[in-house]
């Protein structure tokens, strides 16, 4: 099948990084710079992305392969491929329509990207607070008040200010 | 699963108008606010204006207020941005995002249209 094929189109013996040039009588021709062919028998190349302003190459155009972008930081990559490159924010915040805005109390992120989240009901594991939360951490649970000797104390979590939510906006 | 596509983009002169659609599938439209986010070149995300799940609450970035109208149709489920006096500035790849900031959420955002706005 495969001789038969190539006796019914010459192209699909050009390999990857090559195009059948209908000018050059379907002759295999080289991608020209700056543009790629990722499979054979293509009767064009692609032209490369090119990674620029707040997206940096990651990786650089081929021949047989496009380039691959990353962001520049204080940015982070969303979709496929990286199409677009999303704001980071501190730990302690997150990213609203208006900008970077510090965790309300009784929640916390400690990455760059994402959601404020409430800090954990250590009490709901019949747990005691063992350190406090912050803007950037969670609370830390430890034994439960049966559980410590006599003497012992436990860090009592401040009483919440608000229910636990998102930053204002 | 959830499908955004959006169209209604082009080349056009400072001073012109556009109107962006935005057809959503694949999840109940008419229970979310809708956003409208844009990458220029070389820049990262902006947000640029929403509009709340019964329509009748709307947000926008202080670069396009007075400019752009956000409107949606939950019968068609398609989410519209009205774009009017562009300037060059506003040249970028717009996106249609069910939620907004993108990366906080599930990827839910469309395959953007590109808007030129050049003399």
């Known amino acids: 099948f495969e001789r038969t094929r190539s006796l019914q189109d010459p192209c699909s013996n050009c390999p990857a990084g090559t195009f059948c040039d209908n000018n050059r009588n379907q002759i295999c021709s080289p991608c020209p710079p700056n543009s790629f062919s990722s499979a054979g028998g293509q009767r064009t190349c692609d032209i490369c992305r090119q990674c620029k302003g707040v997206f940096r190459t990651r990786k650089e155009c081929s021949s047989t392969s496009n380039a691959e972008c990353d962001c520049t930081p204080g940015f982070h990559c969303l979709g496929a491929g990286c199409s677009m490159c999303e704001q980071d924010c501190k730990q302690g915040q997150e990213l609203t329509k208006k900008g970077c805005k510090d965790c309300c109390f009784g929640t916390f992120n400690d990455q760059k990207r994402g959601i404020c989240r409430p800090w954990t009901n250590c009490s709901l594991d019949g747990k005691s607070v063992l350190v406090n939360g912050t803007k950037e951490r969670d609370v830390v649970c430890g034994p439960s008040p049966a559980d410590l000797s006599p003497g012992a104390s436990s860090v009592t979590p401040p009483a919440p200010a608000r229910e636990p939510g998102h930053s204002p906006q | 699963q959830v499908q955004l596509v959006e169209s209604g983009g082009g080349l056009v002169h400072p001073g012109g108008s556009l109107r962006l659609s935005c057809a959503a599938s694949g999840f109940i439209f008419s229970l979310y606010t809708m956003s409208w986010v844009r990458q220029a070149p070389g820049k990262g995300l902006e947000w640029v204006s929403d509009i709340n799940s019964g329509g009748d609450s709307t947000d926008y970035a202080d670069s396009v207020k007075g400019r752009f109208t956000i409107s949606r149709d939950n019968a068609k489920s398609t989410l519209y941005l009205q774009m009017n006096s562009l300037k060059p500035e506003d040249t970028a790849v717009y996106y249609c995002?069910?939620?907004?900031?993108?990366?906080?959420?599930?990827?839910?955002w469309g395959q953007g249209t590109q808007v030129t706005v050049s003399s």
């Open positions: 995002a069910k939620d907004y900031p993108l990366g906080q959420r599930e990827d839910y």
